[in-house]
Interface confidence: low
């Protein structure tokens, strides 16, 4: 079929010069020469489907899947991977070919699979299929750590069933809130699997290997703290171990702690107590409730009671499968050039998510903050006032979530013009999208006030260049205007900008730019 576009599929391997684990680098710096993946038409397929040669990638390698399309006019595209779709931004190379890229940073098991690229051009629609797999037969994994009680000892063992064997560390903090951030001087790290000092305020265990770092916090109810406004909630999957620590401090040893599930005392063997005197001679008691492998019927309100403190509860919810709950509707924002603004996504998820923010094929690190109501929030403020599409992507072992944001920056239009033998075209960014007027400059109208309405063709911005909306207006040449100066003007609520063009030669000849505010 002669209407079919000429397609080239390539793989670019990036040498990661940032080999640190778990960092989201923007774009891998050093590239090897592209490898042609063929992209042959797939026989007996409904619709036009091109299939690239299978791609095998080393764990933690960074690659780009790239498609070059030699088709007339604009193209739009969409990537689909594991039931998630991701809009893509085609750009054009020096030979005016459409270029569509998918960057995979630090390849992991979850990023292996089929990548489908849907392309829509003015002439036709077609699909390109990439299959990406991990080269290594020994698939790397990094599993969230969990706790076990040490046989015959009052100590916790931290276990992470990961490959390669992870380094396990306990992260301990004895102060409250913000001062327990990872880099804080209040934080103590112990690179060992067994922890005997279980009286601290905040106890986490982290496991790290080539794939990154995963942490699990020891869920704690502190009877000396004012309870949260909303009941703390703990999610677990069927089969996972449950650990809740109840902690209380009193002036002397004359108090006891008990655990109840839905007003029924926990069975022996599902709890153990430890106590110690603190430096000021007050007594600290902790009582652990634990279930080595939870079932659906372990769901409910776990209440820790003390003979000397008000009791507090936590809601434990056992789920069959992990989840990510958040609204995935896309959001559009319009801000001024110097306005402070952050994108934010509020979500509830279990297990904890891994996430990235992406803009213009660059990935940015994603931070999560837990809120008091059981929700978490991720904010992205590093947009540098660049308009375009921003993508938040989150995943855990069982679920994936993608949310699109559009950022528009209110600014006055800037006009660029070009002319050919048969037409003159003007382009403008600026937001809100500008409207266009064309004017003819002549003896009768030396101030170029004579409006041209014939032969004008305005195009809505249907393509982004570097994240900016572009609007264009084209004037088809007629005998009536040949040899004259014409002026195209773009205007929006923030101002007007014009460009003057001489319509007598095939080359572009803009020579005056007017900026009228």
């Amino acid at each position: 079929n002669q209407d079919l576009p000429v397609i080239k599929c390539v793989l670019i391997n990036h040498k990661n010069n940032d080999s640190s684990v778990g960092k989201s680098s923007s774009y891998p710096m050093v590239s090897e020469s592209p490898e042609d993946l063929g992209c042959a038409l797939r026989p007996q397929s409904s619709g036009t489907v091109y299939e690239a040669a299978a791609v095998e990638v080393d764990v933690s390698a960074s690659i780009t899947l790239q498609v070059l399309v030699d088709a007339p006019g604009n193209i739009s595209c969409l990537w689909v991977f594991k039931h998630s779709s991701l809009n893509c931004q085609p750009h054009f190379d020096l030979q005016n070919r459409g270029v569509v890229s998918m960057v995979i940073l630090k390849m992991t098991e979850t990023q292996a699979g089929e990548y489908l690229l849907f392309i829509q051009s003015e002439a036709t629609n077609y699909t390109i299929l990439f299959t990406v797999s991990i080269r290594n037969t020994l698939l790397y994994t990094l599993r969230r750590p969990y706790f076990r009680k040490m046989e015959n000892q009052d100590a916790l063992v931290c276990i992470s069933e990961s490959v390669p064997e992870p380094i396990v560390e306990w992260v301990l903090c004895d102060s409250q809130g913000e001062s327990c951030k990872e880099e804080s001087p209040a934080v103590v790290k112990k690179e060992e699997k067994v922890l005997h000092e279980l009286f601290g305020t905040d106890i986490r265990c982290c496991a790290r290997n080539e794939l990154g770092r995963e942490c699990t916090r020891l869920f704690t109810i502190d009877l000396n703290q004012t309870p949260q406004t909303t009941l703390p909630q703990l999610f677990l999957k069927v089969g996972e171990p449950l650990w809740i620590r109840c902690k209380a401090v009193h002036v002397n040893h004359g108090f006891g702690l008990t655990w109840e599930l839905e007003n029924k005392a926990l069975e022996e063997g599902n709890y153990f107590e430890m106590s110690t005197y603190s430096t000021n001679r007050t007594m600290i008691r902790i009582l652990f409730a634990f279930v080595s492998s939870v079932a659906r019927n372990d769901t409910g309100y776990y209440t820790c009671s003390s003979s000397k403190h008000p009791s507090q509860s936590a809601l434990v919810t056992i789920v069959e499968k992990g989840f990510i709950n958040a609204t995935n509707s896309s959001e559009d924002y319009e801000i001024d050039q110097y306005e402070e603004f952050c994108f934010s996504v509020r979500f509830k998820a279990y297990p904890q998510i891994r996430c990235t923010w992406t803009f213009s094929r660059k990935s940015f690190p994603c931070e999560q903050k837990g809120l008091d109501n059981g929700y978490s929030i991720s904010k992205f403020c590093n947009h540098k006032h660049q308009p375009g599409e921003y993508i938040f992507h989150a995943e855990n072992d069982d679920a994936q979530f993608t949310k699109m944001f559009t950022l528009n920056i209110r600014r006055k239009p800037q006009v660029l013009a070009e002319a050919s033998a048969s037409q003159a075209s003007c382009f403008s960014d600026g937001y809100p999208l500008p409207s266009w007027t064309w004017k003819k400059c002549s003896d009768k109208s030396p101030n170029c006030t004579e409006e041209i309405t014939e032969g004008v063709w305005n195009r809505k911005a249907n393509r982004k260049v570097f994240g900016q909306w572009v609007s264009s207006s084209t004037l088809n040449m007629s005998e009536a205007i040949k040899g004259f100066l014409v002026k195209c003007c773009a205007y929006n609520s923030l101002g007007t900008s014009c460009e003057t063009i001489l319509l007598n030669s095939p080359g572009p000849f803009p020579f005056i730019q007017d900026n009228i505010s």
Epitope: V163, K189, E191, E192, K193
Partner: antibody
């Protein structure tokens, strides 16, 4: 080349302490581990403990827990092993050994690739 | 702690012989197992790491195999300088533990 030079032989009384030093040359103490291993006369090798000099994190065998202290001074590239409450069964040659981390088929493996010449500690009344 | 047991405790062989020493762990140590050679009055020397990888500078007549709990050190053709004591050691988890050693003597 990489060398580990240990302090000289020691004769100690039961109940006292001994501190053995191990100076690294040809590399700085920024490798992942520095280990201490002992060997009683005519016996096999026994791991005493190890330290990650960069962080000061220590690991000890249960047998020595509470009696042994391993430290490292990065500025002088020297590691130390102090053993207290000495008893006659602590008589042994004590070796320091540099930890090595080697990659093969998707995993990192840890071993001890460079050893000191050994320090004989004799505990006798 | 993980116990490491070597067999035999000692063995006699001649130059040119093929010799096999085995090491068993009390629980799985995956492939995190090293072999060392020690000569009288000398410090041990690392021969094999990760169960089967030859340490640089070690002759190719030495080889290692196994994973999980059972491991083997093989010397394909004994040389006079190979008569020594050999130790296996797990680095799967601290405390690192050694086998009791296998003494290889000249027949």
């Amino acid at each position: 080349q990489v060398q580990l030079v240990q302090s000289g032989a020691e004769v100690k009384k039961p109940g006292s302490s001994v501190k053995v030093s191990c100076k690294a040359s040809g590399y700085t103490l920024n490798e992942l581990f520095m280990h201490w291993v002992r060997q009683a006369p005519g016996q096999g090798l026994e791991w005493v403990g190890g330290i990650i000099p960069m962080s000061g994190t220590t690991f000890y065998a249960q047998t020595f827990q509470g009696r042994v202290t391993i430290t490292a001074d990065e500025s002088t590239s020297t590691a130390y092993m102090e053993l207290s409450s000495l008893r006659s069964e602590d008589t042994a040659v004590y070796y320091c050994a540099k930890g090595v981390r080697q990659y093969s088929y998707g995993r990192y493996y840890y071993g001890m690739d460079v050893w000191g010449q050994g320090t004989l500690v004799t505990v006798s009344s | 702690d993980i116990q490491m047991t070597q067999s035999p405790s000692s063995l006699s062989a001649s130059v040119g012989d093929r010799v096999t020493i085995t090491c068993r762990a009390s629980q799985s140590v995956s492939s995190y197992l090293n072999w060392y050679q020690q000569k009288p009055g000398k410090a041990p020397k690392l021969l094999i790491y990760g169960a089967s990888n030859l340490q640089s500078g070690v002759p190719s007549r030495f080889s290692g195999s196994g994973s999980g709990t059972d491991f083997t050190l093989t010397i394909s053709s004994l040389q006079p300088e190979d008569f020594a004591t050999y130790y296996c050691q797990q680095s799967y988890t601290t405390p690192w533990t050694f086998g009791q050693g296998t003494r290889l003597e000249i027949k």
